[in-house]
Structures are given as C-alpha cells and as structure tokens.
Amino acid sequence: EDGGPACYGGFDLYFILDKSGSVLHHWNEIYYFVEQLAHRFISPQLRMSFIVFSTRGTTLMKLTEDREQIRQGLEELQKVLPGGDTYMHEGFERASEQIYYENSQGYRTASVIIALTDGELHEDLFFYSEREANRSRDLGAIVYCVGVKDFNETQLARIADSKDHVFPVNDGFQALQGIIHSILKKSCIEILAAEPSTICAGESFQVVVRGNGFRHARNVDRVLCSFKINDSVTLNEKPFAVEDTYLLCPAPILKEVGMKAALQVSMNDGLSFISSSVIITTTHCSDGS
C-alpha cells in the first residue's frame, strides 16, 4: 500500500454505487475511489460487498472477506457500463437483504454502508430510498452517503444516518479522491488494543478499549463493550465513558486462569458487533501483586 491511513475494524462494508446514465463518463473516477478505499480496510475479519444500482439493483460482489474475491470484484466493478435511472432504493434493498441473511445466521456483525450517488432523487424515488435506508438501519447498519455534483444534500442527510454522515463532493467526480481520507476516518470503527490485556483471575477490573470511531454511533448511549469468553458466552457491558478513541469499560470477572475474552464493540445496543483480534487473558495474581 501507499502508507496512507488504514482501518483495522472487523465489520461488513457495503458499497452501494450509482451506475445510472448520468455517471457514464465518470465511472473510472467512481471505480478508483472504491478501489482506493477498499484497499485501506485491512482487517482479515472485514467483509465487503459491491452493489450497483440504476433501473435495478445488482450485487456485483456478494459479501466476502476473501481478498482474491475482492480483487476479482474490483475487476468486475471496473467493467461496469453505466446506464439507466437512479433507483437508489434498489441498492439499499440489496444491502438489507444481505444483512438480513447474515443476521439470520445467528452472529450479528456490524454493517457499514457507503452509498454514492450524483443528481437529485425525484420525490417518489427519494421516499423509497429513505424507506429502504431505514430498513438497513433497522437491521443494524450505519449509513453514509457520498454526494457528487448535482446531489441534494438535504435528501442525502435523510437517507444517511445524519448530516454528519454525508460527504459532499461539490467539485465533480475528479474530487472524489480528496475525500478518501475523511470517509475512511469517519466510517472506520476499529478496536486496536485493551489496557490491561492481562487481568487477574477472579477479580473485577476496568478495561480501556483503545481504537477509533466509537462516537460514530447514532446514539452514544447505545455503545456497548462486549466480551466473548472462550469462544462461547458473550457478556455485554455498558461503558463508563465513550470517547472517539477509547472506551472505559467494566471487564467481566473471569474466574479461572487462562480464560480468554475476545473484545467486541456494539454501536447499537447489541444488535450487531464490530469484531477485533484483541484478546484479554487471565493470569494468577498473588495477594501482594
């Protein structure tokens, strides 16, 4: 990679991309924007899907963490020939569908949607798009919108989670590259470390969860620290403090030496979880330590 910023968060990332007739001469810029962004999400637990919409929504690459499949998906994306209407709701339908399938598997991974469009949505199409984006939210997704050229920012603020979840690109498609850093920073929710990473068996502790994006939740009161103990039981704890780069959480009491708790974070009261490779382990502590 080029040494630029990267995201280590483990979640499901959906790109919903406008391929209507109006982007015909700008598809390369859209492709390079997605390609640059895709390469910066580097967690092995991150899965990605490419969805395109015009008069119909199509899942170009179904959800996968396989980097070879993602490479092939990007190749398919580059070959897309834009044309048709801007049925953005069709793109959201295809994302919601996949989130629903993943949720029905039992384990609920957090979902982040980045939807890109140009142009204003006609009233009925805006209604459908907002409705489908709401359905994605109901299923636990965080929704960001990228608006290029003649977009309506008020519309996109209602399709996205909030005005702060909209990335306006007013200078046309060539300016898409300029927002990669900020979209990565805003859409990335990652767990980087836990302090302490080793705790005393049988004792109560507080853990500082280091990372990024913890205040990207629609409601910070719904942020939870989650501990998956020995790959079986999951315990959710309400943090004492939520800051963008850290959480202060009560750690569960792990009774035995050698127990492991994998750290996860939920941004929506346990509806879905961001996974990580961060593990807290227990050790024997003598009375004087």
């Epitope: 199509t58 339908e93 569908e97 996949q98 629903y100 359905r135 109901d138």
Partner: antibody, heavy 117, light 107 residues
Amino acid sequence: QVQLKESGPALVKPTQTLTLTCTFSGFSLSTSGGGVSWIRQPPGKALEWLAHIYSNDDKSYSTSLKTRLTISKDTSKNQVVLTMTNMDPVDTATYYCARGGYFLDYWGQGTLVTVSS
Amino acid sequence: DIELTQPPSVSVAPGQTARISCSGDNIGGIYVHWYQQKPGQAPVLVIYADSKRPSGIPERFSGSNSGNTATLTISGTQAEDEADYYCQSYDITSLVFGGGTKLTVLG
C-alpha cells in the same frame, strides 16, 4: 419454537371479501428486520406471493393484486390479517402465511379457500 | 420484476445426483432460495442466500448461483426427496417464485 397458523372461511362467494388471520408464536413482530408474508397456491399450481408486512409496519403487495389486498398486524395479539376483496373462483387456493423478510423460513400448514356460489 | 424459470420436471435414480435449475436475467447478482414441498404439505426452506442450509436440512442439499442460473443440487438422492421444488428471490420489494420443478426419484 416458531409456529404459524392460518384461519378463515373455507368457502366464500364470488364478489365477497376474504379475511384471513395468521396467528403466530415463537417470535415477535416488534423485533427489527423480519415480518410475515402471505402466499397462495391454487390446486396443482405454483406458489404465488401476495403480500408482506415488516416489523416497522411497512407493507408490500403483489403488483398484480395490489388493488385487492390489505395486510395489517396486531403485534400484541401476535396476528397478521390479510383481506382480499372481490373474490373470484380463480382465487380458489390454499393460503399460507410464513415468517421472513427476504426468504421464508417458517410456514403455516395452510388453509384451503374455495370460491363458489 | 425478475422472472424465475424452472424446468417442469427432473428425474433421478436413487443414490444419484439431482440438479434443478432456476434461470433469470443476471440471477447471479441477486440471492436465490429453495423450498421443498411434498404433496399435501406446506413448503419447507432447504437452501437460502444461494448456498446456506438451514439447521435440520441434510448435507446432501446444496446450492449455487452465478451468471443467469441458480442450481439446487441433491447428492445421493433418496426416495424421500421426491417432491416439488421452488426457487424464490426478492426483487423490488416483492418475493418472486419460480414455477416449480417436480423431482421424481425413479424405481
């Protein structure tokens, strides 16, 4: 465990309105994401989807039957109701309700509705 | 809406592999689900999201989907697998079913 059961008249006259009730247990319609669909199957023919109601009360209908169908839910009673106006003999079918959003993972056993004068 | 087309019937000898197709325009870009329906019974979901198997469904049932065709494969077909099979997808807020395929297990 999840169970669904359809109830309603076995016989309706042409031009009448059919009202079917789906009573379910083992899941809640107030939970995000899912919903209940109605599907029918004329004797010896294929399945035909009719309508769906989501947990957030959004509704969707079969394009060809949209003007005749109404779906509603009573979350407290764990019931979903389908009404179909202006019944015709070609509407004779087994009517099923099923749980799901984008696919249907649990089905009722179905209720046969005959339309005849 | 998308149209899903299935062959009316497929025959297979016991122990052999049965393949039931479901075709539609660029069906690989959407998800396909499969139901089994035995006479006088309600349909049962056997495959969802192209290839995922619900709990309780035997491993001999599998699914794939690419291009313009989704396929339900039953390996080592048994007499009890004789039934009607329907593919289904989701398109523009509607659930769409294929016309159904009658699977006959010979002998």
